[in-house]
């Protein structure tokens, strides 16, 4: 029972995490214009992995895709790659874990096969989560570096009174979604790996041993005991738990407008 719960919960947590990673990857708000200590602009800029957007005070929003591959910074390409690898691994992990779920019976699949699949999906979730966390962290580091660079030359004097304002970018909502989602996927993966230990039966057959007592010749033959580890559920009398957990997809909602401080 505990194994089923751990495995099911691991699956659900990973599912939510991967949905979050997909949402974060698609979101436009990876970096948003820094409004603090800045002249108040009637135009708000924000950028994602795939396009950059401008929302005017009028409410008009214009987004432009990055239609070049070679012209983009290597770091951005690396972040894209990490997020995509995370999504792909997570998706494969989900597919594998569905068949590995203890509450789902597929033909005459052995517990050992389910244990292996659970471990495989768990490792995939862990790597997926790490990819997402790494991707988001690389992007965040890039933002911090650029932020302080642009702060250093925030105002570049041009012929006395004329000044050029450099737009500074700070952390967008997608970064937080990505960090949380990556963490959830990672936790889900760890839970799957823990569940795997409870699923895997350690076949330890004790050989028949003869004990010779003085006066009587009696042979004690203990039957082949199965030593179960950890969460040890009786492998002979399995219970099937139907109706896996339902999850609600994360709804990504964008604010209708930005406040200009």
């Amino acid at each position: 029972m505990a194994v089923t719960a751990c495995q099911g919960l691991g699956f659900v947590v990973s599912l939510i995490g991967i949905a979050g990673i997909i949402a974060a990857t698609c979101m436009d708000q990876w970096s948003t214009q820094d409004l603090y200590n800045n002249p108040v602009t009637a135009v708000f800029n924000y950028q994602g992995l795939w396009r950059s957007c401008v929302r005017e005070s009028s409410g008009f929003t214009e987004c432009r895709g990055y239609f070049t591959l070679l012209g983009l910074p290597a770091m951005l390409q690396a972040v894209r790659a990490l997020m995509i690898v995370g999504i792909v691994l997570g998706a494969i992990g989900l597919l594998v874990s569905i068949f590995a779920l203890k509450c789902i019976r597929i033909g005459s699949m052995e517990d050992s096969a389910k244990a292996n699949m659970t471990l495989t999906s768990g490792i995939m979730f862990i790597v997926s989560g790490l990819c997402a966390i790494a991707g988001v962290s690389v992007f965040a580091n890039m933002l911090v570096t650029n932020f302080w660079m642009s702060t250093a030359n925030m105002y570049t004097g041009m012929g006395g009174m004329v000044q050029t304002v450099q737009t500074r970018y700070t952390f967008g909502a997608a970064l937080f979604v990505g960090w949380v989602a990556g963490g959830l996927t990672l936790i889900g993966g760890v839970m799957m790996c823990i569940a795997c230990r409870g699923l895997a039966p350690e076949e330890t057959n004790y050989k028949a041993v003869s004990y010779h007592a003085s006066g009587h010749s009696v042979a004690y033959k203990p039957g082949g005991f199965k030593a179960s580890t950890g969460f040890g559920s009786n492998t002979k009398n399995k219970k099937i738990y139907d109706g896996g957990a339902r999850t609600e997809d994360e709804v990504q909602s964008y604010p209708s407008k930005h406040d200009y401080v």
């Epitope: 800029n45 005017e56 304002v165 450099q166 737009t167 407008k257």
Partner: antibody
Framework: QVQLQQPGAELVKPGASVKLSCKAS????????MNWVKQRPGQGLEWIGN????????HYNQKFKDKATLTVDKSSSTAYMQLSSLTSEDSAVFYC???????????WGQGTTLTVSS | DIVMTQSPSSLTVTAGEKVTMSCKSS????????????LTWYQQKPGQPPKLLIY???TRESGVPDRFTGSGSGTDFTLTISSVQAEDLAVFYC?????????FGSGTKLEIK
Amino acid sequence: QVQLQQPGAELVKPGASVKLSCKASGYTFTRYRMNWVKQRPGQGLEWIGNIDPSDSETHYNQKFKDKATLTVDKSSSTAYMQLSSLTSEDSAVFYCARLNYGNCFDYWGQGTTLTVSS
Amino acid sequence: DIVMTQSPSSLTVTAGEKVTMSCKSSQTLLNSGNQKNYLTWYQQKPGQPPKLLIYWASTRESGVPDRFTGSGSGTDFTLTISSVQAEDLAVFYCQNDYFYPFTFGSGTKLEIK
């Protein structure tokens, strides 16, 4: 077609308050911010502030923060600007104007001539 | 606040002449996000409200004659009337649409001989 209708003139006494109106028609009122602009006789244009009719979020020019209060009535598609503690300096033509993409004012009312006199 | 400086304050020309007027802002009006300049030109004829001519520094509003052309970027902008007509008698204002509060230039008065 888009129209912004304003009363032609208002005459008020110094120290009093006045509420100027701007009735919008020909478009979805809540989709566009409404701006107010002041023009003193023979002078240039001064932006007072704007309001988002969908949620009444406002931006003010600090110069007019204590002078003007912007409101809207969605049911009648009308924007209002209340001016308080009026002095002769407030005598001017007040325009309402719709904010469109490019943050430009694409449609203007005919203006209300406010005269502050005792 | 952003200061918009227009020059000349007035100019007198004959019909058919080419006219240019300048507008300078105290800070750049170029938005890095979409590479657009948030500067607008308005025309105000006597006794009328201002009329939108050009937005995003160079985009002509629909219905505006093509003799009106906006140019410039960053802090320096120009409005050009290729062939002045008698009906162009008006005051022309430039406006900062990038920073709050929105600010207008003092205007350039165009007079016809």
